[in-house]
């Protein structure tokens, strides 16, 4: 039996930040679980891990340098990402593993979310207005 995951098809990261909600066909309340977010078609980069243990404080970390946080809902984990770069525009996949109670469960691969990181548009300084338009 596999957990189903729903994600938004696309999100735009303005100000280099985005919130990605992973919705599961499973209630995570009072479960020990490991929710993770993966980057790339092959999910090669583990962006962020949220570890939950019986509704206690979530433990959040990234082995790949991403600034992330997580929030738990009954059937969802929302990943908050900060300081994203334009070249990190990619497809991101939610993954969930339930370790306890038995049986161990994980998810069917989701369709993923394309996160489009928009560069900040810097206003020209009044001292350096830049080239004037013709």
């Amino acid at each position: 039996n596999k957990i189903l995951v729903k994600q938004s098809p696309m999100l735009v990261a303005y100000d280099n930040a985005v919130n990605l909600s992973c919705k599961y066909s499973y209630n995570l309340f009072s479960r020990e679980f490991r929710a993770s977010l993966h980057k790339g078609l092959d999910s090669a980069v583990e962006v962020c891990v949220v570890y939950g243990n019986y509704s206690q404080q979530l433990q959040v970390y990234s082995k790949t340098g991403f600034n992330c946080d997580g929030k738990l809902g009954n059937e969802s984990v929302t990943f908050y990402l900060q300081n994203l770069y334009v070249n990190q525009t990619d497809i991101y996949f939610c993954k969930i593993e339930v370790m306890y109670p038995p049986p161990y469960l994980d998810n069917e691969k989701s369709n993923g979310t394309i996160i489009h990181v928009k560069g900040k548009h810097l206003c020209p300084s009044p001292l350096f207005p830049g080239p004037s338009k013709p």
Partner: antibody
Framework: EVQLVESGGGLVQPGGSLRLSCAAS????????MHWVRQAPGKGLVWVSR????????SHADSVRGRFTISRDNAKNTLYLQMNSLRAEDTAVYYC?????????????WGQGTLITVSS | EIVLTQSPATLSLSPGERATLSCRAS??????LAWYQQKPGQAPRLLIY???NRATGIPARFSGSGSGTDFTLTISSLEPEDFALYYC?????????FGQGTKVEIK
């Protein structure tokens, strides 16, 4: 005026435990991420742990993960660091620090620090 | 993790002189860099955030510049109270990391 006051430091044997506290005042404590940063004698600053504003999530440096636990009591405006399985290399001044609302990992106000010495 | 290298380790100057401190990152941190001042026996104090923005209450003689991997903290004219340790810190990547510090001492 923002104030952060740490307490709970002292001498502890290797393998022992200690709980640090940081009493906050002068700002809406429950609205801010909080951190612990340490500084070994004569050395530089090293980030240790963080907790989000409502206490529902936390992160720890690899060197302390599984041994240290950060927590907070927003009703008491207090931040905590539970330190277990202490090692000699944990000897340091421990500072609590506030993150500004605009970013998770800058530190705009710091406490005066509390010294932990791990030695037999 | 990102390594920040500060130079020089020690800067010996007289009051009134200009101080230029450097911080180099092992990879780009965009503009997510802060500077702190620490005096002996005291807590660090935030001076500059996001490479060039002065924190509340910081005098105009302190300025920051740079982006990517190379950053500079400039103290235009040193006051007696400016002789201290200075640290840079990045928040671009997790975990946040600090440089090893530059000591500005009286010549």
């Amino acid at each position: 005026e923002v104030q952060l006051v740490e307490s709970g430091g002292g001498l502890v044997q290797p393998g022992g435990s200690l709980r640090l506290s940081c009493a906050a005042s002068g700002f809406t404590f429950s609205s801010y991420w909080m951190h612990w940063v340490r500084q070994a004698p004569g050395k530089g600053l090293v980030w240790v742990s963080r907790i989000n504003s409502d206490g529902s999530s936390a992160s720890h440096a690899d060197s302390v993960r599984g041994r240290f636990t950060i927590s907070r009591d927003n009703a008491k405006n207090t931040l905590y660091l539970q330190m277990n399985s202490l090692r000699a290399e944990d000897t340091a001044v421990y500072y609590c620090a506030r993150a500004p609302s605009s970013s998770w990992y800058d530190f705009d106000y710091w406490g005066q620090g509390t010294l932990i010495t791990v030695s037999s | 993790e990102i390594v920040l290298t500060q130079s020089p380790a020690t800067l010996s100057l007289s009051p009134g002189e200009r101080a230029t401190l450097s911080c180099r990152a092992s990879q780009s941190v965009s503009r997510y860099l802060a500077w702190y001042q620490q005096k002996p026996g005291q807590a660090p104090r935030l001076l500059i955030y996001d490479a060039s923005n002065r924190a509340t209450g910081i005098p105009a003689r302190f300025s920051g510049s740079g982006s990517g991997t190379d950053f500079t903290l400039t103290i235009s004219s040193l006051e007696p109270e400016d002789f201290a340790l200075y640290y840079c810190q990045q928040r671009s990547n997790w975990p946040p990391t600090f440089g090893q510090g530059t000591k500005v001492e009286i010549k």
